[in-house]
Amino acid sequence: EPPTACREKQYLINSQCCSLCQPGQKLVSDCTEFTETECLPCGESEFLDTWNRETHCHQHKYCDPNLGLRVQQKGTSETDTICTCEEGWHCTSEACESCVLHRSCSPGFGVKQIATGVSDTICEPCPVGFFSNVSSAFEKCHPWTSCETKDLVVQQAGTNKTDVVCGPQDRLRA
């Protein structure tokens, strides 16, 4: 009685259970009454990352420098190449097929999380008591200057974009 299901790492063909090819190898010939499955290693710049019955290996991903990409991890016969972005850029998707320049946080906003090769800058509005007067991909919101610690008084209130302006205390004369 021919099998209707096969063990793990096998596949059913022509009423026979054949061994799948191991990662890094492609299928040449299905097993037969006389022979085991025939597999061949993937070529240079090719890979297969699972037990498989593929007749063609997949091409390694190309990290195109024209798109701001560079190789983070070189592919093997069993793994794909992993791309990342050049310094100052980040991936537009999880697959990292292209890069965009890191976003800068506008005045009134500070950097909450600095960008990486795979994630953009995260900005946050400067809360009361903090400001940012530059457009930057690195600068956090800075605290307003404390006039009191300098024995000065606030002459102009700060905003989310400007620091306070301190000045000398008015001395009342008798």
Epitope: S19, V28, S29, T32, E36
Partner: antibody, heavy 113, light 112 residues
Framework: QVQLQESGPGLVKPSETLSITCTVS????????VYWIRQPPGKGPEWMGM???????DYSTSLKSRLTISKDTSKSQVSLKMSSLTAADTAVYYC???????WGQGTLVTVSS | ELQLTQSPLSLPVTLGQPASISCRSS???????????LHWYLQRPGQSPRLLIY???NRFSGVPDRFSGSGSGTDFTLKISRVEAEDVGVYYC?????????FGGGTKLEIK
């Protein structure tokens, strides 16, 4: 449908080289393996060697030194070449696909001067 | 090189009676994957060998169920439950586990 057909010289002189071609149809030689068997008159079959789908070859220990099996996938042909023939090489030569029971009709080769 | 030894060399059988042929291998025919590539062929007079049984016990398509194969490791048997006239010929065991592939010397079945 699957077919294999051998074409050989029929008569070969001792010490000469034998060339037989197996032309196949109904399948691709890049996906299937083919082996060669010979059977001398009144004797049992002898496995000679094979050409795997991936292009590698295996040979009988006793024939290895004078046997070459090759293929031309685009022409759907597997070739057998055997040198230094003697009368003991007189046999019917078959090419066979390595699955099911697909045999060529066989070609009789007689080695005689 | 692996040897396959068949017995008996000649097997006279009465029509309708059972027949049994033995094939012994000089080393185990179990492959690393667990398959055992031991096969049985029948060669009728004037014909090429025809596959009866593959991988010890699997009947090839179109082969009558009076033919059965069994065994493991190095000892294998072909059985015919009731011999018919068309079963006359030479039976060969063959292995494709180890390169070079080999054939047994043959068993000639004839009707008594």
């Amino acid at each position: 449908q699957v077919q294999l057909q051998e074409s050989g010289p029929g008569l070969v002189k001792p010490s000469e080289t034998l060339s037989i071609t197996c032309t196949v149809s109904g399948f691709s030689l890049s996906r299937y393996s083919v082996y060669w068997i010979r059977q001398p008159p009144g004797k049992g079959p002898e496995w000679m060697g094979m050409m795997w789908g991936g292009g590698s070859t295996d040979y009988s220990t006793s024939l290895k030194s004078r046997l070459t099996i090759s293929k031309d996938t685009s022409k759907s042909q597997v070739s057998l070449k055997m040198s230094s023939l003697t009368a003991a090489d007189t046999a019917v030569y078959y090419c066979v696909r390595t699955d099911g029971d697909y045999w060529g009709q066989g070609t009789l080769v007689t080695v005689s001067s | 090189e692996l040897q396959l030894t068949q017995s008996p060399l000649s097997l006279p059988v009465t029509l309708g009676q059972p027949a049994s042929i033995s094939c012994r291998s000089s080393q185990s025919l179990a492959s690393s994957s667990g398959n055992t590539y031991l096969h049985w062929y029948l060669q009728r007079p004037g014909q090429s060998p025809r596959l009866l049984i593959y991988k010890v016990s699997n009947r090839f398509s179109g082969v009558p169920d009076r033919f059965s194969g069994s065994g493991s490791g190095t000892d294998f048997t072909l059985k015919i439950s009731r011999v018919e006239a068309e079963d006359v010929g030479v039976y060969y065991c063959s292995q494709s586990t180890h390169v070079p592939w080999t054939f047994g010397g043959g068993t000639k079945l004839e009707i008594k």
